[in-house]
């Protein structure tokens, strides 16, 4: 009986530790995509609807804030698309990019952790164009550090929750 009690206590402890593991999956807020043809910061994301969830991390002012020190896996998926029903592209040569940036408040600094993308020729003769970027990496993050996303040509973003999103989850403590 004692062994059983110990075992279930261990399970509970494991489970509560897992439940306390920070994670976030944020999806684009399609009603508030900024305009611009150069690099802009995406500040409007959902954290509590559809596929979007957050636990033991904070989303504020368009940035994902780390609450616990640790090693985190960060990822971002950005889809760009254009269909001729919305009009024509003013230029057919495009640089479609995403930048995942870490900002530190304690020591004011900003670093690009990951970037991805390509230059594209989207011919006006085609009805539909699509391009997807996925970046991911393992980073040591400290409490208070902020993660943000910048993209080029936001007017071409695919606004679906399965297309444009980013997130993080803690993998282990810092020894």
């Amino acid at each position: 009986e004692k062994a059983m009690v110990d075992g279930s206590w261990l399970d509970l402890a494991k489970r509560s530790k897992l439940e306390a593991q920070p994670f976030a999956h944020l999806t684009i807020n399609a009603t508030d995509i900024p305009s611009g043809s150069h690099k802009v910061s995406l500040s409007s994301w959902y954290h509590d609807r559809g596929w979007a969830k957050i636990s033991n991390m904070t989303f504020s002012n368009g940035k994902l804030i780390v609450n616990q020190d640790g090693f985190y896996y960060l990822y971002a998926n950005i889809c760009f698309r254009h269909h001729e029903t919305s009009g024509d592209l003013a230029t057919e040569y495009l640089q479609l990019m995403v930048y995942v940036t870490k900002t530190s408040i304690k020591i004011p600094s900003s670093h690009t952790l990951m970037k991805g993308g390509s230059t594209k020729y989207w011919s006006g003769n085609s009805e539909f164009h699509f391009y997807s970027i996925n970046v991911g990496g393992f980073f040591k993050l400290r409490s208070g550090e902020e993660i943000s996303i910048e993209v080029s040509n936001p007017s071409l973003l695919d606004p679906d929750q399965d297309a444009t999103y980013f997130g993080a989850f803690k993998v282990r403590d810092i020894d």
Epitope: G36, T85, A90, T91, P154
Partner: antibody, heavy 126, light 103 residues
């Protein structure tokens, strides 16, 4: 206020060319596209082509490809449309119109024509 | 190539009447539809863009609705100055026009 002022009426013989100008004022000319649209007597409006005033990129209707040239002079805030090898069915009122999309804010030419010129009547007759 | 079809091609109504013009696209165009007013000898005027957004300076008696392939322009109370031809438009394609007259 935004204004597009076009050149005056023209009469041409079949086979000739015509060049219509469209002078813009009241906004930053380079930040918008200019479209050319025409209306022949008793016909619907017909889109001919556009020019991105910022970079000079153009797109034309297949119907006019090879006969039309659209240019711009950013210093003079003026767009020009030249139509060659004129025939009688090119008799129409030709309009320039500004696309509502600001190219600084995005790169999609949306085909909302928010300001129009007063129109230029081109008559093709022998 | 998308084709825009308007109906009716002309109509006659009294001042104060509610007038409705329909525009159909040959395939779905989401909400990318605009309406213009043309008066002889005058520059065309954008009334409605994006199917239902009223262009700045246009009287509120004009309204637009619809999505997909079927759209309507409504004049809630026809005024004498509304005598004109109205065109729907999606990108490069225009409807054939609806001429509105006063009875």
């Amino acid at each position: 206020q935004v204004q597009l002022v076009q050149s005056g009426a023209e009469v041409r013989k079949p086979g000739a060319s015509v060049k219509v100008s469209c002078k813009a004022s009241g906004y930053d000319f380079s930040n918008y596209a200019i479209h050319w649209v025409r209306q022949a007597p008793g016909q619907r409006l017909e889109w001919m082509g556009w020019i991105n005033a910022g970079n000079g990129n153009t797109k034309f209707s297949q119907k006019f490809q090879g006969r039309i040239t659209v240019t711009r002079d950013t210093a003079a805030s003026t767009a020009y449309m030249e139509l060659r090898s004129l025939r009688s069915e090119d008799t129409a009122v030709y309009y320039c119109a500004r696309d509502h999309s600001n190219m600084v804010r995005g790169i999609i030419i949306a085909y909302y024509f928010d300001y129009w010129g007063q129109g230029t009547l081109v008559t093709v007759s022998s | 190539e998308i084709v825009m079809t308007q109906s009716p091609s002309s109509l006659s109504a009294s001042v104060g009447d509610r007038v409705t013009i329909t525009c159909r696209a040959s395939q779905s165009i989401s909400r990318y539809l605009n309406w213009y007013q043309l008066k002889p000898g005058k520059a065309p005027r954008l009334l409605i863009y994006g199917a239902s957004s009223l262009q700045s300076g246009v009287p509120s008696r004009f309204s637009g609705s619809g999505s997909g392939a079927e759209f309507t322009l409504t004049i809630s109370s026809l005024q004498p100055e509304d005598i004109a031809t109205y065109y729907c438009q999606h990108t490069r394609a225009f409807g054939q026009g609806t001429k509105v007259e006063i009875k």
